[in-house]
């Protein structure tokens, strides 16, 4: 099993996840590792010489850059917050701010913007992955209620006035809760089904 | 995956002109050097032209100051473009990309140059 630098007539390497083609001297030379760059090119005779990233930068894959790439901060103008900081193995990891989505995306998320408010009565829709898409907004099943206009209030139970030794005064709607009254306490007359005369 | 497709061969007289393209498509991110190789009938492939990630360039010495490789990385396109054809350019024309900040390495499927009169 030859070790790089070896010669290649066919343009290909043994290993391509570690090895790269370097097509005029027609070897294969060794890529440097995550968190290394090429600080010496490979020859016939001298494998590829690699070298730390400095601080503030990366290399993520085994490659052959001359140089590591700075690290780049989460952009709290385009919407992003950090999540894990950057390392000479990995670029700063961000995502969307709470209450926010990913508009623009290009390998990664690039621009988030405000998520839409869902009106009274609905809900947003529960996603696999937080911050990957605009709400889409549901109505509240059935016995459930959400009052408000907001990008993430849930629907709630309507209260049940019995567990409070209450009796209903008049039902829930998906927009409101149910409003419950001391038994004790008259009907007001427009709820009331006689009318004294 | 990357793909790599090549267009603007044909049959040319001695003394025209050709310009190949080779558009890759799929997956294609990154930083990559780009070559044109060529294979003429019962001969080894040859290298013909590189254009590095870092803008630099090089040719074989049998087509230096005749064929001129370049690229839009807008596009994802490599070019090559062929003056002063010879009956000995005759050949398959690949093109091929190796992905320099990670692994990668992609062929085109080839496109035929005949410079014949």
């Known amino acids: 099993q030859a070790v790089p630098p070896y010669a290649s007539e066919n343009q290909t390497c043994r290993d391509q996840e570690k090895e790269y083609y370097e097509p005029q001297h027609r070897i294969c030379c060794s890529r440097c590792p995550p968190g290394t760059y090429v600080s010496a090119k490979c020859s016939r005779i001298r494998d590829t010489v690699c070298a730390t990233c400095a601080e503030n930068s990366y290399n993520e894959h085994w490659n052959y850059l001359t140089i590591c790439q700075l690290c780049r901060p989460c952009d709290p103008v385009m919407g992003l917050e950090e999540i894990a900081p950057c390392t000479s193995k990995r670029k700063t990891q961000c995502r969307c701010q709470p209450g926010m989505f990913c508009a623009a995306w290009a390998l990664e998320c690039t621009h988030c913007e405000l998520l839409s408010d869902c009106p009274p009565g609905t809900e947003a829709e529960l996603k696999d992955e937080v911050g990957k898409g605009n709400n889409h907004c549901v109505p509240c099943k059935a016995g459930h209620f959400q009052n408000t206009s907001s990008p993430s209030a849930r629907c709630q139970p309507h209260t049940r006035c019995e567990n409070q030794g209450l009796v209903e005064a008049a039902p829930g709607t998906a927009q409101s809760d149910t409003t419950c009254k001391n038994p004790l306490e008259p009907l007001p007359p427009e709820m009331s089904g006689t009318m004294l005369m | 995956d990357v793909q790599l497709v090549e267009s603007g061969g044909g049959l040319v007289q001695p003394g025209g002109s050709l310009r190949l393209s080779c558009a890759a498509s799929g997956r294609f991110f990154g930083i990559y050097d780009m070559y044109w190789y060529r294979q003429a009938p019962g001969k080894q492939r040859e290298l013909v032209a590189i254009s590095t990630s870092g803008g630099h360039t090089n040719y074989a010495d049998s087509v230096k100051g005749r064929f001129t490789i370049s690229r839009d990385n807008a596009k994802n396109t490599v070019y090559l473009q062929m003056n002063s054809l010879r009956p000995e350019d005759t050949a398959v024309y690949y093109c091929?990309?190796?992905?320099?900040?990670?692994?990668?390495?992609?062929w085109g499927q080839g496109t035929l140059v005949t410079v014949s009169s």
């Open positions: 091929n990309i190796q992905r320099v900040d990670a692994p990668g390495f992609y």
